[in-house]
């Protein structure tokens, strides 16, 4: 008897991170024997959608004409062949940006930093959030992911870099998110250009392990101070 049917491949075009209102197509690719494709969304009644295969039957298209909060989440797909249903695909995480206003990203004490010194990137959100992501342009994954340890919502997260090397130079953006759905992100912050001067060709730096603070100094404008437990944010390197 043959083994289980191979799992299909699941992907999104133009990508898995989509701005609010933009269109996205989810593709599920199985085998030529497929008769039907099913897409399941985590925490939604299954199946989320069913589609007949497109010729030559080895894949199906699931269209989202306008991205909204309802579509953000974790998906898996299956196909049915004459011998039964396949194994589930690896999950696809569809993330929506534009769920909240853009945070602001600053470099302290300055975006111009000498190699070997320290710099802290500060991401501040308008409303309290519990997850902050720092992205470096042309990097494959989020550089840094800070999440509140106890769900305490905070207006800012600090990303310390020390010692700074030439590797740190480049363009950064940050996003903020709520714990109830990490598939919903804010608009990206305006870009911040970090310029490292006097750079030596240092080895790749290791991240600092200090934790961000929950609230800023007393004069921090329009952001509550002392109203949030100083639980800090847990640091995740990805």
């Amino acid at each position: 008897q043959a083994g289980p049917l191979p799992k299909p491949t699941l992907w999104a075009e133009p990508g898995s991170v989509i701005s609010w209102g933009n269109s996205v197509t989810i593709w599920c690719q199985g085998t030529l024997e497929a008769r039907e494709y099913r897409l399941d969304k985590e925490e939604s009644p299954a199946p989320w959608d069913r589609q007949n295969p497109l010729e030559p039957k080895n894949k199906a298209r699931f269209s989202i004409p306008s991205m909204t909060e309802d579509y953000a989440g974790r998906y898996r797909c299956y196909y049915r062949s004459p011998v039964g249903w396949s194994q589930p695909s690896d999950p696809l995480e569809l993330v929506m940006t534009g769920a909240y206003s853009k945070p602001t990203l600053s470099a302290l004490p300055s975006p111009l930093v000498t190699s070997g010194k320290s710099v802290t990137l500060l991401c501040q959100s308008r409303s309290p959030m519990d997850t902050f992501l720092l992205i470096k342009e042309r990097a494959a994954h989020p550089l840094l992911h800070l999440r509140s340890e106890h769900g305490a919502q905070q207006h800012q997260a600090e990303f310390p870099m020390s010692p700074v090397t030439s590797v740190h130079g480049g363009t950064y953006r940050c996003f903020s998110s709520h714990g109830f759905s990490h598939y919903l992100l804010s608009h990206p912050s305006d870009p911040l250009e970090l310029i490292v001067s006097g750079s030596l060709e240092d080895p790749r730096p290791s991240p600092t392990r200090s934790v961000s603070t929950a609230a800023g100094p007393e004069d921090q404008p329009l952001m509550p101070t002392g109203s949030v437990p100083h639980s800090g944010l847990r640091r995740h390197w990805e």
């Epitope: 909240y100 853009k102 004490p109 404008p221 329009l222």
Partner: antibody, heavy 117, light 113 residues
């Protein structure tokens, strides 16, 4: 594209109340604060307060406290501002505006409220 | 409350010339937490809603022509239009967002000479 469309002009008598609406489209409604700003004829801009659609949280300028109420209907992506005990100095154009980071990146077209006996 | 004072109240400038509008706040708008100035500039044409031009004192909003520039820090800020165009005739407002209540300057009316 982001749009804030406000209700039409109102003429009210002193002591009455007025309720102005602001319907949002073109963005994720729940995640952005909506503020209201007053502009009397030929004068400058004055901040009234905000509402956060996601939670219904509000904050009002002390000057308007007790007379202003902001509400939200998430099902229609609409926010409302009600101003009570109207007096002649409430005659103004009232704008709703979307907050970016405490500044305002999109504005409604304005609603003229005239208070006259 | 933070009081915002603009000068001059009105200004007439020839087409192609530089226009400068000043805004002074009653307390510093510079945050020591992020080294940013919590100040925005808006343009309001007759019969229209205000339009965001500048935020963080010097960051130009997307779609705003580069002849508009914001500068200054602390309590003193400037909006400069490097080469005045006919469509720039409007009233300009500064706004502080350092603390509630949010407050605006009284406005500066810009006309063509």
């Amino acid at each position: 594209q982001v749009q804030l469309v406000q209700s039409g002009a109102e003429v009210k008598k002193p002591g009455a109340s007025v309720k102005v609406s602001c319907k949002a489209s073109g963005y994720s409604f729940s995640g952005f604060y909506i503020d209201w700003v007053k502009q009397p004829p030929g004068k400058g801009l004055e901040w009234i307060g905000y509402i956060f659609p996601s939670s219904g949280e509000t904050s009002y300028n002390q000057k308007f406290k007790g007379r202003v109420t902001m509400t939200v209907d998430k099902s229609t992506s609409t926010v409302y501002m009600e101003l009570s005990s109207l007096r002649s100095e409430d005659t103004a154009v009232y704008y709703c505006a979307r907050q970016a980071f405490y500044y305002f990146d999109y504005w409604g077209q304005g609603t003229t409220v005239t208070v006259s006996s | 409350d933070i009081v915002m004072t603009q000068s001059p109240d009105s200004l007439a400038v020839s087409l192609g010339e530089r226009a400068t509008i000043n805004c002074k706040s009653s307390q510093s708008l510079l945050s020591s937490s992020n080294q940013k100035n919590y100040l925005a500039w808006y343009q309001q044409k007759p019969g229209q809603a205000p339009r965001l031009l500048i935020y963080w004192a010097s960051t130009r909003e997307s779609g705003v022509p580069d002849r508009f520039a914001g500068s200054g820090s602390g309590t003193d800020f400037t909006l400069t239009i490097s080469s005045l165009q006919a469509e720039d005739v409007a009233v300009y407002y500064c706004q502080q967002y350092y603390s509630y209540p949010l407050t605006f300057g009284q406005g500066t009316k810009l006309e063509i000479k």
